[in-house]
């Protein structure tokens, strides 16, 4: 049974050319996080944070995505095209998969960045990969 909830930075805005931190946090579960995937609105992957092996930043974003802080992601040199939805997908054992959503608006003006942290509904599915029980590292 999936008991966890994902907290995210919610709807955020940032200035063009600036940077922004995307953060998700899984709570209310003892499940072990084996991997976190970060995806963009068009479902292209930005980064992977594997609990055992560390970070992988996808080639298309290598020059403007930095890992962290924590399991989060820092987007740099923002453009107007970066406006849209971002998803964090937590692969956990034994619970399965949790997903969080963040909406980023990139602004031309110098409107101050804000970050409204709130809980969002989660999507879950059973995770049947038995080998994942060997992923005992949890960072």
């Amino acid at each position: 049974m999936m008991t966890g909830t994902i907290e995210t930075t919610g709807n955020i805005s940032a200035k063009k050319g600036g940077s922004v931190i995307l953060q998700c946090h899984l709570s209310s579960t003892m499940a072990q996080v084996t991997q976190v995937n970060w995806e963009q609105h068009d479902h292209s992957l930005l980064a992977i944070r594997n609990a055992e092996l560390g970070w992988h930043i996808y080639p298309a974003f290598k020059d403007r995505v930095a890992p962290g802080p924590g399991l989060g992601l820092t987007l740099q040199s923002l453009t107007m095209n970066d406006t849209g939805e971002y998803f964090c997908t937590y692969h956990t054992y034994p619970d399965g998969t949790y997903r969080g959503r963040i909406f980023l608006e990139v602004l031309e003006s110098s409107v101050a960045e804000h970050s409204a942290r709130f809980q969002i509904p989660i999507e879950g599915r059973d995770y049947k990969d038995d080998d994942d029980k060997h992923h005992h590292h949890h960072h």
């Epitope: 084996t34 991997q35 995937n37 992957l45 992977i48 594997n50 055992e52 092996l53 560390g54 970070w55 992988h56 996808y58 080639p59 298309a60 290598k62 692969h91 990969d129 080998d131 994942d132 060997h134 992923h135």
Partner: antibody, heavy 121, light 107 residues
């Protein structure tokens, strides 16, 4: 110690089929993206295809010359990677290597010793 | 299909710097890897993700990748560096090798 051991290479006639295996040990196999790379005698390296980890969909990608005739699969419970080859041609003759894709700093740069596939009548 | 172009051969004197180039359309948008292969042996990864060195690879090996060109640089080249070198363009959907460059260490 990370080890990749390929097996299944053989002499096969054109049009035939063959399945190669790669037994992995020394790391959590389910985490890794795995590729097959081949090298024809006296020639350069040629990427055949890859399979991603289940946490990244477990999807496969193939090089154009083998698309439709080669299939990559994995069994994470057995720590084994497979390459099913059908409709083999003489130009498929090569040493086939099993490779861990260079995603992560901790687990990168590992190749097997290769297994020889000879397609000849 | 995506193509990578390498010079077939490069020669260098011992102790000098060898540079091997690899060219491909918008190669800088992908990760470049470099492999060293000696006769009868499996390839060895010497540079990955453009400029990272795997553990055990000497510091004299370095890499860069921008625009349409990736470069492998071997400073203070030694006789043991004589080998074939292959570049590879790597992204989340494909991986393509260059044709290979034979590095000859003179003398």
């Amino acid at each position: 110690e990370v080890q990749l051991v390929e097996s299944g290479g053989d002499l096969v006639k054109p049009g035939g089929s063959l399945r190669l295996s790669c037994a992995a040990s020394g790391f959590t196999f389910s985490n890794a993206w795995m590729s097959w790379v081949r090298q024809a005698p006296g020639k350069g390296l040629e990427w055949v295809g890859r399979i991603k980890s289940k946490a990244n969909g477990g999807t496969t990608d193939y090089a154009a010359p083998v698309k439709g005739s080669f299939t990559i699969s994995r069994d994470d419970s057995k720590n084994t990677l497979y390459l099913q080859m059908s409709s083999l041609k003489t130009e498929d003759t090569a040493v086939y290597y099993c490779v861990i894709d260079p995603l992560y700093d901790i687990l990168t740069g590992y190749w097997g010793r290769g297994t020889l596939v000879t397609v000849s009548s | 299909s995506y193509d990578l172009t390498q010079p077939p051969s490069v020669s260098v004197s011992p102790g000098q710097t060898a540079s091997i180039t690899c060219s491909g359309d918008k190669l800088g948008d992908k990760y470049a890897c470099w492999y060293q292969q000696k006769p009868g042996q499996s390839p060895v990864l010497v540079i990955y993700q453009d400029s990272k060195r795997p553990s055990g690879i000497p510091e004299r090996f370095s890499g860069s990748n921008s625009g349409n060109t990736a470069t492998l640089t071997i400073s203070g080249t030694q006789a043991m560096d004589e080998a074939d070198y292959y570049c590879q363009a790597w992204d989340s959907s494909t991986a393509v090798f260059g044709g290979g460059t034979k590095l000859t260490v003179l003398g």
